[in-house]
């Protein structure tokens, strides 16, 4: 995240960091709690990195140097990456990790609400995102989970200062025209929230940007509620029943 | 499966014009980003141009800036390579390719993916 | 302009034996923004690697590549008949996108 501060335990107690551990162990992606046994993330987190084994899921954490070999971690039963992701096109980036165990829910572990499916005309206006990622484009992985409100900017603003790319309707944008604001390496996957009638609701997963926080370049992030069926289908055809916290 | 066939090259004179089309299929044409790549004879690779997937943003290689346009047909999933004021230089063979645009760490990525076999250009007189 | 230096122009080598390829750039590249293709006689290039070290679809594993900011390797832990050939780095981070003159991997 850049230009962003410092979370608070229990503040955004859906986001988890996904790490792989292979010879050493780094995180590599943030993630977002949907249900007892269900993380919503990014697809290309995924790349090249396909096999569950090697990914350990930390939960209700702040500090990444707090984890220890003794910290309790989550590990993946199931992948599931959307069916028309395609690791050479930047459309449908959003996979399903379905855990081998339920977690229980803590006041610094529990889920986040999905929007309605297809929501369009709610307009919000206070949105923050969240993650460990880089704090410059040429940064590192920052050890306490950072916070930044940005505000979205309309799909037909993002298509003007990405012109090489498609803003599809499945997509949204937050940023400032000036920049100095924004998710960055090591945020993909991560929450993109909005508050709204007193709830948080899961708007958007860190995609895309052009660099970081950069003038007149917003972050572009997959729109969950454009993939509510896939999500409703795909949870409830692996559980037998929904276990997702509902949506507003 | 992806396939790329370029045609139009041949021999022409120093001065003359040459159109090269590159014809797609396999692929949503309408929605990638396509490139021309050329190598001289016994040379490297050298990049000619691009072109994003609606053809609104173009760029060039210096060394064909203002006498080469690219263009495309997304209706008929053809790419095109305008060349003018053709020089003894740019005798090569001329490749489309097609540029892949995916997310790698919150980035896009860039590469070319797919390539066609190719079609020889020579500016001879 | 980026300028892409690799080095050796020419790697003689006997199959088996590892081959390491080296690229170089003027300024610093975003490490997804860099490919490595390999182009054997009367072929069109074939992309091998992308992103510095992803392999690209059906390429095998004795392919690997790394590297970050200026300097970037390509290794052929264990060269095969069909790996001879000559092999382009390239950069897409800023336009012009530019190539490598190529290394020329020949049979020892």
């Known amino acids: 995240i850049v230009g962003g501060t410092n979370s608070s335990w229990g503040e955004w107690p859906w986001q988890v960091s996904l790490q792989v551990k292979l010879t050493a162990q780094r995180h590599l992606c943030g993630g977002s709690l949907i249900g007892h046994q269900w993380v919503l993330t990014a697809a290309h987190c995924f790349d090249g990195l396909p096999l569950q084994d090697v990914w350990r899921i930390y939960s209700g954490i702040l500090n990444l140097s707090d984890i220890t070999k003794d910290t309790p971690f989550s590990q993946i039963k199931e992948i599931i990456i959307h069916q028309n992701y395609k690791v050479s096109e930047g459309n449908h980036d959003i996979a399903l990790i379905k855990l081998q165990a339920p977690l229980n829910y803590t006041e610094f572990q529990k889920p986040i609400c999905l929007p309605s499916k297809g929501d369009t005309s709610t307009i919000y206006t206070n949105c923050w995102v969240t993650g460990w990622g880089f704090s410059k484009e040429k940064g590192e992985i920052q050890n306490i989970l950072q916070k930044v409100n940005i505000p979205l900017v309309t799909n037909e603003e993002c298509q003007k200062r990405y012109q090489d790319y498609k803003i599809t309707q499945r997509m949204v944008c937050a940023g400032y025209k000036e920049g100095g604001k924004d998710a960055c390496k090591g945020d993909s996957g991560g929450p993109l929230v909005c508050k709204h009638n007193g709830m948080w609701r899961l708007v958007g997963i860190t995609s895309w940007g052009e660099g970081c926080a950069r003038r007149e370049q917003p972050g572009v992030y997959t729109k969950v509620a454009e993939y509510m069926d896939w999500i409703l289908e795909k949870t409830q055809s692996s559980d037998g029943k929904a276990q997702m916290q509902s949506p507003a | 499966e992806v396939q790329l066939l370029e045609s139009g090259g041949g021999l022409v004179q120093p001065g003359g014009s040459l159109r090269l089309s590159c014809a797609a299929s396999g692929f949503t044409f309408s929605s990638q980003q396509m490139v021309w790549v050329r190598q001289a004879p016994g040379k490297g690779l050298e990049w000619v141009s691009y072109?994003?997937?609606?053809?609104?943003?173009?760029y060039y290689a210096d060394s064909v800036k203002g006498r080469f346009t690219i263009s495309r047909d997304n209706s008929k999933n053809t790419l095109y390579l305008q060349m003018n004021s053709l020089r003894a230089e740019d005798t090569a063979v001329y490749y489309c390719?097609?540029?892949?645009?995916?997310?790698?760490?919150?980035?896009?990525?860039?590469?070319?993916?797919?390539w066609g076999q190719g079609t020889l250009v020579t500016v001879s007189s | 302009d980026i300028q892409m230096t690799q080095s050796p122009g020419t790697l003689s080598l006997s199959p088996g034996e590892r081959a390491t390829l080296s690229c170089r750039t003027s300024?610093?590249?975003?490490?997804?923004?860099l490919a490595w293709y390999q182009q054997t006689p009367g072929q069109a290039p074939r992309l091998l690697i992308y992103?510095?070290?992803s392999r690209a679809t059906g390429i095998p594993d004795r392919f690997s590549g790394t590297g970050y900011g200026t300097d970037f390797t390509l290794t052929i832990s264990r060269l095969e008949p069909e790996d001879y050939g000559t092999y382009y780095c390239q950069q897409s981070s800023r336009t012009p996108w530019t190539f490598g003159q190529g290394t020329r991997v020949e049979i020892k």
């Open positions: 992103g510095a070290s």
């Open positions: 390719a097609r540029v892949a645009r995916g997310i790698a760490a919150r980035s896009r990525t860039s590469y070319f993916d797919y």
């Open positions: 072109i994003s997937p609606s053809g609104g943003n173009t």
């Open positions: 300024q610093f590249v975003n490490s997804n923004y």
